[in-house]
């Protein structure tokens, strides 16, 4: 294939690969013809003036994970055809100015995970077609103003991974075609108002895992295509109210591991997209009416790891369309009786590692889909009669480490317990806590006939007994169903899938897979 | 104490229906289950069904033959079974709880022409 | 269904000997990490009487003489010390799933 160098393999579409270790310079000679060439896992050190020279209808070109440390400025001449070029996972701290002069068809440009200590705005003046430019993983501790002003043209930029401070609020300001930006895991302590002004075609904006304290009211206004927007790991403490009122396409929006103490009703939309709502691993101690009634069409509702000890009845009107609600690892005792009565569509509930001592017979009244509870580790004595009889998809009940009083009062939770056992999974049996002579034992085969007869006035209120599980072919009598598909966390879609890892569900949000954010 | 008391013998043309019932005392007759068990002469037992808190649930062998229902007034639970054939001559016994601790003495029904 | 299947169908024992009589169920009767595994005793012209549920528990009144044993598929009723009170049919019975069902019976004499 019109010479292809030994340490190298040549395939017919032109495509070149030269890989190992015992590589220490550009391989010669390269076929003139070859349209792809990557060059990974060697010792390469420099690239030298022109060792592309022979190769110009060169497209693509790929110098990764080897330890380049210097590029002299005419190391790409005559390279006109080139769209892609690759200087990822490299050793490279300073980019000679010039080097990419006369790339003039080039359009994604990837230099992360070097050590590039800065960039100005003379490195990317001449790339005025570049589409993409990756810098994230780098030690860039300051962005200056111009340097990207003639990439009008860009549409995803993403600079995370460094060790940036602060924007400057005309950094951005000629990225007009803009759709994707990324900012996260950097020092940033506060974005200077108008700083995203000019991105009005935004679409992704990651600003997770920074120092980020306060938002700017206005910060977002002018984003009306925004679609994706991750604060989570910042220490917001607070939300004005206006943050988020000009965000239509929002559909994912991630605010865990921030400080939040409150959230005000109205704080969220109007957001008619909105999805998925991460909340937690934050300071937040009560929910009032109506906070999220703007999210018609949230389907994921995360508050667990909160403070949260009051729920007002309202709190969750508008939601009609959840599916998931996590308010586990919080400081509730009480709840009121029709706090989820407008989750008509709620699968998932989980409650647990809470302080609830007891619960309305109505809790679940409205919430006919119910396919999961969780209510483990709480303060639990009894449930009320009925309180599970109507949800005929139940398939998860965990009630597993909860003072249980094993009076005759817990016969019908226990007999539902029994006579619904091929529908629930097969947890940790609910323990006996007293009285005294049945501690230790299991819920389920106490000796009914020592069981302490009640002597108290009974806490809750039942509701009417209903047939718990209807005798009709859609429950068939042998069918076991296994556990529901549990939630995952929110995946920022660039992160490295080795990050994810399985979590027990008494961990981060009582779910069994997590990918970090 | 805790007692089951069934109703008494019954003889059946084939074809018709018998209602056996099962009268309870001495607990909360609203807080558990009672099974019917039927044992053919010289045979082993048979689960029927169940009734609880007015849901039910049979055995698919007798799904639509057999019925039933209880009157907490009185604090006893009916067994119906129609379309009778000389195959289900048996004793019929009530049992109470998920783990059947306490049985009523039988009702003999017997399906002849 | 879940069949349960015991053995021996007849058991002869000499009074204040060990009886031992096993059942076996088609599928796995653990649920919870429990056995949903019980036995029954039963006396010519007499219902049936709850000797041992959730395969270990014994129901009230039960002498000590009767234990239960097992796991999973594999159950055994033991009588420790036979006495003339005890010649009667014995039938386990799973109540993991409906329909809920019985064994055969193992008819025990005396020797």
């Known amino acids: 294939y019109h010479g292809c160098p030994s340490e190298c393999t040549c395939s017919r579409a032109s495509q070149v690969e030269c890989t190992g270790a015992r590589i220490v310079a550009v391989p010669t000679p390269l076929p003139w013809n070859a349209m792809s060439l990557q060059i990974l896992n060697t010792h390469i050190t420099e690239l030298n003036e022109s060792p592309f020279l022979n190769i110009s209808a060169l497209i693509a070109l790929r110098i990764e994970k080897n330890e380049l440390s210097r590029i002299t400025p005419g190391a790409f001449r005559n390279l006109g055809s080139l769209r892609y070029l690759s200087l990822a996972n490299n050793k490279l701290q300073v980019l000679p100015i010039g080097l990419f002069q006369g790339l003039d068809s080039l359009e994604s440009l990837l230099l992360s995970s070097n050590q590039l200590l800065q960039i100005q705005p003379a490195h990317f003046s001449q790339c005025s077609n570049l589409k993409e430019l990756q810098l994230h993983g780098n030690h860039l501790e300051y962005i200056p103003d111009g340097a990207f002003d003639h990439l009008v043209g860009l549409t995803k930029l993403n600079l995370g991974k460094n060790s940036l401070t602060h924007i400057s609020p005309r950094v951005f300001q000629h990225l007009g075609n803009l759709q994707v930006l990324r900012l996260y895991e950097n020092r940033l302590t506060d974005i200077p108002m108008g700083t995203f002004d000019g991105l009005v075609n935004l679409q992704e904006l990651a600003l997770q895992q920074n120092q980020i304290g306060l938002l700017s009211p206005g910060l977002f206004h002018n984003n009306h295509n925004l679609q994706r927007l991750y604060l989570s790991n910042n220490h917001i403490s607070q939300l004005p109210p206006s943050v988020f009122m000009q965000l239509p396409q929002l559909n994912r929006l991630t605010l865990f591991g921030n400080s939040l103490k409150e959230l005000s009703p109205g704080i969220f939309g109007p957001m008619p997209n909105l999805r998925e709502l991460w909340l937690y691993d934050n300071h937040i101690s009560s929910l009032p009416d109506n906070v999220f009634s703007n999210l018609r069409q949230l389907q994921v509702l995360i508050l667990s790891r909160n403070q949260i000890s009051f729920i007002s009845p309202g709190a969750f009107n508008g939601l009609t369309e959840l599916r998931e609600l996590s308010l586990h690892t919080n400081a509730l005792q009480d709840l009121d009786g029709n706090v989820f009565r407008m989750l008509a569509n709620l699968q998932n509930i989980s409650l647990q590692n809470n302080r609830l001592r007891q619960l309305p017979g109505n809790i679940f009244a409205n919430v006919n889909g119910l396919m999961a509870i969780q209510l483990q580790n709480n303060q639990l004595e009894n449930l009320p009669l009925g309180i599970f009889d109507h949800l005929g998809k139940l398939c998860e009940l965990r009630l597993y480490d909860n003072p249980w009083r094993c009076d005759s009062d817990i016969l019908p939770l226990r007999n539902w317990l029994l006579l619904n056992q091929p529908r629930l999974g097969t947890d940790t049996v609910p323990v006996c806590f007293s009285p005294a002579n049945v501690r230790g034992q299991s819920l389920i085969i106490i000796n009914v006939n020592v069981a302490v007869p009640s002597v108290h006035v009974p806490e809750v209120p039942s509701y009417p007994e209903t047939p718990w599980y209807p005798d009709t072919p859609s429950y068939p009598d042998t069918t076991s169903v296994s556990s529901t598909t549990e939630l995952t966390s929110p995946v920022e879609d660039y992160t490295d899938l080795t990050t994810i890892q399985v979590t027990d569900d008494r961990s981060v949000w009582g779910m069994t897979q997590a990918q970090s954010g | 104490q805790v007692q089951l008391v069934q109703s008494g013998a019954e003889v059946k043309k084939p074809g018709a229906s018998v209602k056996v019932s099962c009268k309870a005392s001495g607990y909360t007759f609203t807080s558990f289950v009672i099974h019917w068990v039927r044992q053919a002469p010289g045979q082993g037992l048979e689960w029927m069904g169940y009734?609880?808190?007015?849901?039910?649930k049979y055995n698919e062998r007798f799904r639509g033959r057999a019925t039933l229902t209880r009157d907490t007034s009185t604090s006893t639970v009916y067994m119906e079974l129609s379309s009778l054939r000389s195959e289900d001559t048996a004793v019929y016994y009530c049992?109470?709880?998920?783990?059947?601790?306490?049985w009523g003495q039988g009702t003999l029904v017997t399906v002849s022409s | 269904d879940i069949v349960m299947t015991q053995s021996p169908d007849s058991l002869a024992v000499s009074l204040g000997e060990r009886a031992t009589i096993n059942c076996r169920a088609s599928e796995s009767v653990d649920y919870y990490g429990i056995s949903f595994m019980n036995w029954y005793q039963q006396k010519p012209g007499q219902p049936p009487k709850l000797l041992i549920y959730a395969a270990s528990n014994q129901g009230s009144g039960v002498p000590d003489r009767f234990s239960g044993s097992g796991s999973g598929t594999d159950f055994t009723l033991t009588i420790s010390s036979l006495q003339a009170e005890d010649v009667a049919v014995y039938y386990c019975?799973?109540?993991?799933?409906?329909?809920?069902?019985f064994g055969g019976g193992t008819k025990v004499e005396i020797k």
């Open positions: 019975q799973q109540s993991k799933e409906v329909p809920y069902t």
């Open positions: 049992a109470r709880d998920y783990y059947f601790d306490y």
């Open positions: 009734i609880y808190n007015d849901g039910t």
